[in-house]
Amino acid sequence: SERCDDWGLDTMRQIQVFEDEPARIKCPLFEHFLKFNYSTAHSAGLTLIWYWTRQDRDLEEPINFRLPENRISKEKDVLWFRPTLLNDTGNYTCMLRNTTYCSKVAFPLEVVQKDSCFNSPMKLPVHKLYIEYGIQRITCPNVDGYFPSSVKPTITWYMGCYKIQNFNNVIPEGMNLSFLIALISNNGNYTCVVTYPENGRTFHLTRTLTVKVVGSPKNAVPPVIHSPNDHVVYEKEPGEELLIPCTVYFSFLMDSRNEVWWTIDGKKPDDITIDVTINESISHSRTEDETRTQILSIKKVTSEDLKRSYVCHARSAKGEVAKAAKVKQKVPAPRYTVELACGFGAT
C-alpha cells in the first residue's frame, strides 16, 4: 500500500480501562498529532479506520464491529466498548486516509481487573487537598460523554472499601465529593461508581483517585533556614575536613520550585577553584512540607578557605532567604614551656 505517515506507538497515552465496563477511546490523531479535528477531516472526505494487534501477537487485524449487542462500535472519532472484556487488551491503531493522504497512530489499551475493594494495577491520579482549609471538592473523573445529559446516573462514593455515608467531614454530592475540613485521616483512595441505563442495560463506570492532604497556603511561610545559625561556629585547623550543613524548611506550596544553594565568597561552588563537594538530601512531612539539607564539604581546608564567606541561600514561591555560616580558624593552644634556671651561684 502507499506511504502512510506513521506516528508509531503512542506510549504516552497508556490507556487503562476496567474489565466489564464501558470505555470510550478517542483517536489520539486529532488530539495530539494533527492540526485539524475529526469534523474537518470527515467533511474533507477522509475516512477513519480502526484495527488492532492482540496482546503478545504481531498480526494487525480489523476490529470486529459486528459483535452481539454492538459490544464494540465506532462513533465519529471514538471507539466504544460496551463493555470491555479482558482479552480486548492490545495495541489499537486509528488511521485517517483517502486516496492521497494517510496518517496513523497506535496506542496501548490495557483492560484491568479490580477486586471488590477497587484495588487494581490501574495508575491513579492524585488530587491534593489543603489541610483544614475550608470546603474543597474532588470530582468523579473521566465520565463525560458516556451518557446524555437527560440521563440521571446514580453515583456512589467509597473511601477504600467503605461507602461514604457516615463520614462527618465528607459529603457526597453527586459527581462531587465535598470535604468540609480535609484532615490527614482523609488521605487515601476514593472511588466513585457511576451507574446509568442504556438501551435496557445497566452500565457501571468505576473511577478511583488518590487524595493527598497537603499543607495549606494559609499556613505557608518563606523558607526557614535552621542551619547554619548564630549558635554554631565551625572552628577548624588547616588540613581538617570542613562540613557545614544547610538545612532549610519549606512550607508546601502547590507547583512551587524549592531551591537551596551555597555561595562561597559570593560565587557558586562550581565557579571557584577550591575542591568542594555538596551532597543534598530531601525529606517530607505528612503534609508534604519539605526539608532540604545540603552539606558543603571541603576535605582538607586551608587557612585561606577558613577566611572565606560561606552563605546558604534558599528560595520558594514565598520568598528568598540567606544565612552565613560562622567559620573561623582554630587558634592553636598556647604551648607553655617551663624554663628551669638552676643557678648555683658562688658566694
Partner: antibody, heavy 120, light 113 residues
C-alpha cells in the same frame, strides 16, 4: 454513657448577653466531631445555630447568627460554649446541643436542652 | 441558602395506618437528608440519615426514600408511640461561597384520628 448536657439558660433582658455550656461525657472532643447548637422557639420548629469541629476548632454559623453569637470549645474540659450577645425577644428558645448534626451521621446525639428567655 | 418544605404540616391517622410525609428541597441536595422524630418536652431523635439509611435502634417500619429534591418518610404501620412531630434536615455545600447550607423542614405533626 455517651451524653450531652446543656446549662446556662436563663431569663435575660433584650440587648443582654448569655453564655450557654454543653458538657460532653463518654467521648472526647479531641476526636473528630461536629458539635452544634440547635434552637427551638416555643411551639416552633428546629433551627441550626452554629457548629464547631472539635479536633480542629473550625466553626460554622447560620447566616443570621454571624456577629452576635460565638461558638467555642474547651477540649480539656470536654465542654462546648455558645456566647450570645445583643439578645432579642426572638432568640427566646430551648437551646439544644447535638453531635454530628452538620453532616448527619448515625453517631447523632442530643442533649435535653436549656431554656433561654429574652424579655423585659 | 436552601429551603426545605415539608408536607403536610399535620396529619391525623390511626394505629396500623401507613403514613407518608414528604420533604422538598429548593435545590439538589442529592441524598444528604435526615429525618428526626420529636415528642413534646424531648430532644429530637434521629430516624434516617443519607435519605434512606435507618439509624441504629430505629424500628424497620420507618423507611426513607428519594434523592435530589424530593424525599419521603414512610411509616408502614403506625404504632401508638409514633404520634409525634417529624422534621427533615437537608444539607448541601456551595463551593463558590465556601459555605455549607442546611435547613430543617417546618415539621409534620402526626396526631391520633
Amino acid at each position: 454513657e455517651v451524653q450531652l448536657e446543656e446549662s446556662g439558660g436563663d431569663l435575660v433582658q433584650p440587648g443582654g448577653s448569655l453564655r450557654l455550656s454543653c458538657a460532653a461525657s463518654g467521648f472526647s472532643f479531641s476526636s473528630n466531631y461536629w458539635i452544634c447548637w440547635v434552637r427551638q422557639a416555643p411551639g416552633k420548629g428546629l433551627e441550626l445555630v452554629s457548629c464547631i469541629y472539635t479536633s480542629t476548632g473550625n466553626t460554622w454559623y447560620a447566616s443570621w447568627a454571624k456577629g452576635r453569637f460565638t461558638i467555642s470549645r474547651d477540649n480539656s474540659k470536654n465542654t462546648l460554649y455558645l456566647q450570645m450577645n445583643s439578645l432579642r425577644a426572638e432568640d427566646t428558645a430551648v437551646y439544644f446541643c447535638a453531635r454530628d448534626l452538620l453532616v448527619v451521621t448515625s453517631f447523632n446525639l442530643w442533649g435535653q436542652g436549656t431554656l433561654v428567655t429574652v424579655s423585659s | 441558602d436552601i429551603v426545605m418544605t415539608q408536607s403536610p404540616s399535620s396529619l391525623s391517622a390511626s394505629v396500623g395506618d401507613r403514613v407518608t410525609i414528604t420533604c422538598q428541597a429548593s435545590e439538589d441536595i442529592y441524598s444528604n437528608l435526615a429525618w428526626f422524630q420529636q415528642k413534646p418536652g424531648q430532644a429530637p431523635k434521629l430516624l434516617i440519615y443519607g435519605a434512606s439509611t435507618l439509624a441504629s435502634g430505629v424500628p424497620s417500619r420507618f423507611s426513607g426514600s428519594g434523592s435530589g429534591t424530593e424525599f419521603t418518610l414512610t411509616i408502614s404501620s403506625l404504632q401508638p408511640e409514633d404520634f409525634a412531630t417529624y422534621y427533615c434536615l437537608g444539607v448541601c455545600t456551595d463551593i463558590s461561597t465556601d459555605d455549607l447550607y442546611n435547613a430543617f423542614g417546618q415539621g409534620t405533626k402526626v396526631v391520633i384520628k
